[in-house]
């Protein structure tokens, strides 16, 4: 059974992930971002279901494509280089989802824009955090 210390650690990691995803979204939605229209043309893939930490596998698999799109507006909109930002997220995701079980992600048929993709994972983090508190 999860201990209060492990729950607290999970909660902190989720909050960190949430902040990182929100920072990316804010950087993209920044009114000074001239690349937004172009960035919205890139397709991202969403999980059919995202209710448990193991479903973060679906986020992990889309992190590299996310980094490529962020590279297009790297210097003006983010405090960190996309490579470092995605690397930080990857570390948190790996810790949160665990490596004990190999989960095969199932994706929804319809694609999403980068904004929809980020909003989906922000909602996921908020939802899991709310169950822990």
């Amino acid at each position: 059974a999860p201990t209060s210390s492990s729950t607290k650690k999970t909660q902190l990691q989720l909050e960190h992930l949430l902040l990182d995803l929100q920072m990316i979204l804010n950087g993209i939605n920044n009114y000074k971002n001239p690349k937004l229209t172009r960035m919205l043309t890139f397709k991202f893939y969403m999980p059919k279901k995202a209710t448990e930490l193991k479903h973060l596998q679906c986020l992990e698999e889309e992190l590299k494509p996310l980094e490529e799109v962020l590279n297009l507006a790297q210097s003006k909109n983010f405090h960190l280089r996309p490579r470092d930002l995605i690397s930080n997220i990857n570390v948190i995701v790996l810790e949160l989802k665990g490596s004990e079980t190999t989960f095969m992600c199932e994706y929804a048929d319809e694609t999403a824009t980068i904004v929809e993709f980020l909003n989906r994972w922000i909602t996921f983090c908020q939802s899991i955090i709310s169950t822990l508190t």
Partner: antibody
Framework: QVQLVQSGAEVKKPGSSVKVSCKAS????????IHWVRQAPGQGLEWMGW????????NYAQKFQGRVTLTADTSTSTAYMELSSLRSEDTAVYYC??????????????WGQGTLVTVSS | DIVMTQSPDSLAVSLGERATINCKSS????????????LAWYQQKPGQPPKLLIY???TGQSGVPDRFSGSGSGTDFTLTISSLQAEDVAVYYC?????????FGAGTKVEIK
């Protein structure tokens, strides 16, 4: 049709810089990234970086960071690659290339004819 | 960076025969979301820039003869020339177009036997 025309061959001394140009025609230069790839004599292909001519945003391969500068002049539809602190190992054919799509890592469908840069004392 | 390993280094094939080139990546090039493999093949003749033949592992570039085909998934890929023609003598390169930096194999030289 899409065309990328590069400047002529250069012979440079070690320690100096070289600036290669790539003039785009047949499309709007601001619609696609321009990549630079080099090929040493008898060797394989090595990606150096890309520039988005629309806003000058760049992304360089780590190996060339600090030594390569990519720029673009939208008024003349020309992209430039400047490589500094040249050494003999930089002797290569330098290509500019454009992909089929705006995607940063889409494969390169259009290539310049190449510019041979020879570094020799 | 993803390392691309091609084999063989060179290949001599009789006219009209099949030529097969292999390419292995150090990590998977399959994006699970769209089930696409981000691998391209190029042909380069002496004194010319590379020419894109295939991308997404098996999608032929417009205007490329259909004797050129690509296959494979994950980390193992193959370029096949079904019936070698004299004009196919060249060096062939694979390239991953999955993540920055895009990286190339060392090349395979195809000659007439």
């Amino acid at each position: 049709q899409v065309q990328l025309v590069q400047s002529g061959a250069e012979v440079k001394k070690p320690g100096s810089s070289v600036k290669v140009s790539c003039k785009a025609s047949g499309y709007s230069i601001t619609d696609y990234l321009i990549h630079w790839v080099r090929q040493a004599p008898g060797q394989g292909l090595e990606w150096m970086g890309w520039i988005d001519p629309e806003d000058g945003e760049t992304n360089y391969a780590q190996k060339f960071q600090g030594r390569v500068t990519l720029t673009a002049d939208t008024s003349t539809s020309t992209a430039y690659m400047e490589l500094s602190s040249l050494r003999s190992e930089d002797t290569a054919v330098y290509y500019c290339a454009r992909s089929l799509d705006y995607d940063p890592i889409y494969p390169f469908a259009y290539w310049g004819q190449g510019t041979l840069v020879t570094v020799s004392s | 960076d993803i390392v691309m390993t091609q084999s063989p280094d060179s290949l001599a094939v009789s006219l009209g025969e099949r030529a097969t080139i292999n390419c292995k990546s150090s990590q998977s090039l399959l994006r699970n979301g769209n089930q696409k493999n981000y691998l391209a093949w190029y042909q380069q003749k002496p004194g010319q820039p590379p020419k894109l033949l295939i991308y997404y592992a098996s999608t032929g570039q417009s205007g490329v003869p259909d004797r050129f085909s690509g296959s494979g998934s994950g980390t193992d890929f193959t370029l096949t020339i079904s019936s070698l023609q004299a004009e196919d003598v060249a060096v062939y390169y694979c390239q991953q177009h999955y993540i920055t930096p895009p990286t190339f194999g060392a090349g395979t030289k195809v000659e007439i036997k």
